[in-house]
């Protein structure tokens, strides 16, 4: 029978044994930085090359007994999960192992850095096909380890890491907190976050997605044909490394940004029970469980977007938060969110030649998040058009006036502490899709993009208050690029995109005592690329 | 040569105390620093430390990903090391664990 985890990552309508061919991932090399491994285990023999790299600290304790099978346990299991002949994800992927963890599973930041440097030098000396680096380890937040991961990622290497097993915010750990790394949390057979003793999988905005990580059957170093079940975010990361190898083998030219977007796009959505996460982390944690794409052929015709949350701004009056897209992604819209509702909106601004999304805290606010919508839009030319506060009763509006530019997102930002709920609601005049409309005391920012074949439309869903949440989704074939609230008044906590749905959250009116019957409207901008669709059809 | 004006090198260490490994430090140099400059900076640190009666050991010189070096030394020398030319920041080594 097929292990639950391989069944889970197989797309619907396929059988795992049919879907995972013996040569899957064969064009890809996966580097594993872990313990020593038993490379002649039947699951992985001939698939794993043990490099001569070793940089580990001495084991703790005077009575430590170095038993080979224990020393090899973690790494052997993970190598089996990635490429094992029976229980592996990418059965055709070849692997190279570096020993950076000792027999107790402990290593150092410096040893890991030297290991990453070794990989980079190997890549320069003998360039091969796509490289995936699996880092099934975690330490405290490390600026230098994150920086090294960033450099390696910018050299075209895909890094996949464990989110950590501390039932904590993954942003407090490295390399999990490195934005360029694909950070993986763990779920179980019931699609619940994995509990590990008193702890469990990490969570939060630094996690990219989850993958099976409990009771995972894989190679055991106890004997050359033994199997064992292990659990942890390492096992989850190994699944994603295997899926990445499969995807890169099918499309070797994929960039890191394209691969990450595909991993997110093909994941199972909204299956994780978020109640397991601390309340303040639920909105930040992606509800995604990794899966293989339904076809080994590319999905190049899709317009892929993902949501990137900033770190929390902190509570000071002038505090801001910045969310950034990856280097080869376009920022198509920017929104903000505050649990207290005290915020001064958000704006898109240039920083180092690239657009970023900045959210502003308000006096008495507990802090804000900036939320960027980051998309893959080849040959795009995007700019931000701003209208200052109109002060007129009809509100502030701005549109994309350049020929061929379409509206992909709207933001609003205000200097006053409270826009007030008594102002008349501002509704968008119909038939003007290329226009952002906002409160008269707010500056309005429109993201306007020109890209071959790009077309966008505005979708709205308004319901009278009191209503804690209003949503509007883009239909099949369209991708959500922009998500904002109308009007941007103070009882609106903010707006953010979850997959292809725009979510607008408002304060619970029963607690605020407000009697305003003001309607809250969720405004989604949905786009698609005819150009990408045509290019894909021509290839097929 | 002194560090460039207005760019003070910073010191970082693990927020989780039991995971800290004091006595080993990663000295990260500014982005465009060449290997020869990294080696020179490491030697300079050793020389200045020796003049103060401290023994240091260069464990590794980084190049390829980040310019810098790994050094075994007393924490007393951090102030001195932060003032070296080309230094961007220094991070105390720390533990990582299988997950």
């Amino acid at each position: 029978s097929i292990p639950w985890n391989l069944e889970r990552i197989t797309p619907p309508r396929y059988r795992a044994d049919e879907y995972q061919p013996p040569d899957g991932g064969s064009l890809v090399e996966v580097y594993l930085l872990d313990t020593s491994i038993q490379s002649d285990h039947r699951e992985i023999e001939g698939r794993v090359m043990v490099t001569d790299f070793e940089n580990v600290p001495e084991e703790d304790g005077t009575r430590f007994h170095r038993q080979a099978s224990k020393c090899d346990s973690h790494g052997t299991h993970l190598a089996g999960v990635v490429s094992g002949r029976d229980a592996g994800v990418a059965k055709g992927a070849s692997m190279r192992s570096l020993r950076v963890l000792n027999c107790q599973g402990k290593g150092t930041v410096s040893g890991t850095l030297i290991g990453l440097e070794f990989i980079r030098k190997s890549q320069l000396v003998q360039p091969v096909g796509p490289l995936v680096v699996l880092l099934p380890l975690a330490g405290g937040y490390s600026r230098v380890l994150n920086a090294a991961c960033q450099r390696l990622a910018r050299a075209g290497v895909v890094l996949v890491t464990a989110a950590g097993n501390f039932r904590d915010d993954a942003c407090l750990y490295s390399p999990a907190s490195a934005p360029e790394v694909i950070t993986v949390g763990a779920t179980n057979a019931q699609d619940q976050p994995v509990t590990l003793g008193t702890l469990g999988t990490n969570f939060g905005r630094c996690v990219d997605l989850f993958a099976p990580g409990e009771d995972i059957i894989g190679a055991s170093s106890d004997c050359s044909t033994c199997f064992v079940s292990q659990s942890g975010t390492s096992q989850a990361a190994a699944h994603v490394a295997g899926i990445a190898a499969m995807m890169l083998s099918a499309e070797p030219e994929l960039t890191l940004a394209e691969l990450r977007q595909r991993l997110i796009h093909f994941s199972a959505k909204d299956v994780i029970n978020e109640a397991w996460f601390p309340e303040d982390q639920r909105v930040l944690t992606p509800n995604l469980v990794a899966a293989l794409p339904p076809s080994t052929h590319g999905a190049g015709w899709q317009l892929f977007c993902r949501t990137v949350w900033s770190a929390h701004s902190g509570p000071t009056r002038m505090a801001t938060a910045i969310a950034r897209c990856a280097p080869d992604e376009e920022l198509l819209s920017c929104s903000s969110f505050s649990r207290s509702g005290k915020r001064r909106g958000e704006r898109m601004e240039a920083q180092g030649g690239k657009l970023v999304c900045r959210a502003h805290n308000a006096f008495g606010g507990e802090g804000v998040y900036a939320i960027a919508r980051c998309c893959l839009l080849p040959q795009a030319n995007c700019s931000v058009h701003t209208a200052p506060p109109a002060e007129a009763s009809m509100g502030t509006r701005v549109h994309c006036h350049q020929q061929g530019h379409v509206l992909t997102g709207c933001s609003s930002h205000w200097e006053v502490e409270d826009l007030g709920t008594h102002k008349p609601p501002v509704l968008r005049p119909r038939g003007q899709p290329n226009q952002c409309v906002g409160h008269r005391e707010a500056s309005i920012h429109a993201s306007c993009c020109h890209a071959p074949g790009l077309e966008c439309k505005v979708k709205e869903h308004g319901i009278p208050a009191p209503q804690e949440q209003v949503t509007v989704a883009c239909e099949e074939g369209w991708t959500l690029t922009g998500c904002s609230a109308l009007p941007g008044t103070s009882h609106v906590l903010g707006a953010y995109a979850v997959d292809n749905t725009c979510v607008v959250r408002s304060r619970d009116v029963s607690t605020t005592g407000s009697t305003s019957e003001e309607a809250v409207t969720a405004v989604a901008i949905c786009c698609r690329s005819r150009h990408l669709a045509q290019a894909s059809q021509e290839l097929q | 040569e002194a560090p460039e004006h207005g760019t003070t090198a910073t010191f970082h260490r693990c927020a989780k105390d039991p995971w800290r490994l004091p006595g080993t430090y990663v000295v990260v140099l500014k982005e465009e620093t060449h290997l020869s400059q990294s080696e020179r900076t490491a030697r300079r640190l050793q020389a200045q430390a020796a003049r103060r009666g401290y023994l240091t050991k260069i464990l590794h010189v980084f190049h390829g990903l980040l310019p810098g070096f790994l050094v075994k030394m007393s924490g007393d020398l951090l102030e001195l090391a932060l003032k070296l030319p080309h230094v961007d920041y220094i991070e105390e080594d720390s533990s990582v664990f299988a997950q």
Epitope: D17, P22, Q38, S39, D40, R42, E45, G46, V48, M49, V50, A68, S69, R85, C223, S224, T225 | -
Partner: antibody, heavy 115, light 107 residues
Framework: QVQLVQSGAEVKKPGASVKVSCKAS????????ISWVRQAPGQGLEWMGW????????NYAQKLQGRGTMTTDPSTSTAYMELRSLRSDDTAVYYC????????WGQGTTVTVSS | DIQMTQSPSSLSASVGDRVTITCRAS??????LDWYQQKPGKAPKLLIY???TRPSGVPSRFSGSGSGTDFTLTISSLQPEDFATYYC?????????FGQGTKVEIK
């Protein structure tokens, strides 16, 4: 290139022991164990067991019933298969092969058990 | 142990013929089936692994197919050097077990 070179033919009396060697070269030893397979005259192939160069672990076919011992000496890149209490039906060509996949084979060692 | 049954046990064919040998497992072995070629006085040589994958250096006239319990080795156009005995071997379980062999002779 990758190759396995076995020791020469042996003639043994019933009850005696034989030790066949297999020297591996051209690949990283630790990445593969060595399988031993035998073929009686005019018969098919029979897997006898597997031994690790990495840690000396073994995996024997039940039929050997404790009569066989497989070992490795990584320092000389050599694997050994010893068969004790030889019987006439142990007369066969003994092959070593790389790993469980058995993708590379030695040239074979003929062991004749005869009184 | 898993039993492997090959058919036919021998066959006569001419150069250029298309030859098919079948192998049946006593239980499902997924795609874990290998084919070997053995010439008199020589060691077996791996021809096909994982039911259908050809190692580098094996001519493309050799192909394998099947999954579960039924497998086939096909030689699309028999060459003089292909006259030999062919063995199938299951690689699903330990111990690996071989078929009894199919001898391909010159007609």
């Amino acid at each position: 290139q990758v190759q396995l070179v076995q020791s020469g033919a042996e003639v043994k009396k019933p009850g005696a022991s034989v030790k066949v060697s297999c020297k591996a070269s051209g690949y990283t030893l630790n990445n593969y164990g060595i399988s031993w397979v035998r073929q009686a005259p005019g018969q098919g192939l029979e897997w006898m067991g597997w031994v690790s160069f990495y840690n000396g672990n073994t995996n024997y076919a039940q039929k050997l019933q404790g009569r066989g011992t497989m070992t490795t000496d990584p320092s000389t890149s050599t694997a050994y298969m010893e068969l004790r209490s030889l019987r006439s039906d142990d007369t066969a060509v003994y092959y070593c092969a790389r790993g469980y996949v058995m993708d590379i084979w030695g040239q074979g060692t003929t062991v004749t058990v005869s009184s | 142990d898993i039993q492997m049954t090959q058919s036919p046990s021998s066959l006569s064919a001419s150069v250029g013929d298309r030859v098919t040998i079948t192998c049946r497992a006593s239980q499902s072995i997924n795609n874990w089936l290998d084919w070997y070629q053995q010439k008199p006085g020589k060691a077996p040589k791996l021809l096909i692994y994982a039911a259908s994958t050809r190692p580098s250096g094996v001519p493309s006239r050799f192909s394998g197919s099947g999954s579960g319990t039924d497998f086939t080795l096909t030689i699309s156009s028999l060459q003089p050097e292909d006259f030999a005995t062919y063995y199938c071997q299951q690689d699903q379980d330990i111990p690996p077990t071989f078929g009894q062999g199919t001898k391909v002779e010159i007609k």
